[in-house]
């Protein structure tokens, strides 16, 4: 009985109420190997999630986050509020950088700017909020 | 007793229209998920349409879209398949069918009855 679950293709499932046929997956669900025995019911792209793929019999939907937000995670399991460059989120929401510290993309955390007197530089251009200081020669 | 009944099938010209039935018995259709699958000769079982309250939507095959559409009474608990523009490839049984979620988050569907021929030819 288990060689022909094994013969049925993605897509499908086997049905131990009919014989164990292959029955093709309902609706809104998928299976992406063969011999399952259910298939799985497909993630939805809802609310800040928008749907990057849609769901096909063999495989799941695939979702990004919308305008505004990142994802994070594997698949893109959460989406996270995009801050401006030169600011990080904080449980406040999006917050600028202190003085001495840079962010240069609009996710993470600001980062301190590099000491260039730790490598006997100079400092050729100050930092800001959103850029790192560039250190001159030494 | 779970039962659903389909009726309806029969012979139409290309082009033509029929109305399937499927009479639920043991269970609220309203309250689940549902459709028809179809078996054309020597083929394998085939999703044509479904009402999912899970996902909040109809569902169509792409080949039927435009030309099927599915419904139901809930008074009297009973499934339709609106079917116009027949083709020739519709020929089938048309199964009436209760789409099964499981604990485990598994899906499945189940259904119950002879189902109902449709012939489409001239």
């Known amino acids: 009985l288990q060689d022909l679950c094994s013969n049925c293709p993605a897509g499908t499932f086997c049905d131990n109420n009919r014989s164990q046929i292959c029955s093709p997956c309902p609706p809104n669900s998928f299976s992406s190997a063969g011999g399952q025995r259910t298939c799985d019911i497909c993630r939805q792209c809802k609310g800040v999630f928008k749907t990057r793929k849609e769901c096909s019999s063999t495989s799941n939907a695939e979702c990004d986050c919308i305008s505004g937000y990142h994802c994070l995670g594997a698949e893109c399991s959460m989406c996270e509020q995009d801050c401006k460059q030169g600011q990080e989120l904080t449980k406040k929401g999006c917050k600028d950088c202190c003085f001495g510290t840079f962010n240069d993309q609009k996710r993470g955390i600001c980062r301190p700017w590099t000491n260039c007197s730790l490598d006997g530089k100079s400092v050729l251009v100050n930092g800001t909020k959103e850029r790192d200081v560039v250190c001159g020669p030494s | 007793e779970v039962q659903l009944l389909e009726s309806g099938g029969g012979l139409v010209q290309p082009g033509g229209s029929l109305r399937l039935s499927c009479a639920a018995s043991?269970?609220?259709?309203?309250?689940?998920?549902v459709g028809w699958v179809r078996q054309a000769p020597g083929k394998g079982l085939e999703w044509v349409s479904a009402?999912?309250?899970?996902?909040?939507?109809?569902y169509y095959a792409d080949s039927v879209k435009g030309r099927f559409t599915i419904s139901r009474d809930n008074s009297k608990n009973t499934l339709y398949l609106q079917m116009n523009s027949l083709r020739a490839e519709d020929t089938a049984v048309y199964y009436c069918?209760?789409?099964?979620?499981?604990?485990?988050?598994?899906?499945?569907?189940?259904?119950w009855g002879q189902g109902t021929l449709v012939t489409v030819s001239s």
């Open positions: 043991g269970f609220m259709l309203s309250a689940e998920d």
């Open positions: 069918a209760r789409v099964v979620y499981h604990a485990g988050g598994g899906v499945t569907f189940d259904y």
């Open positions: 009402i999912l309250d899970f996902g909040g939507s109809t």
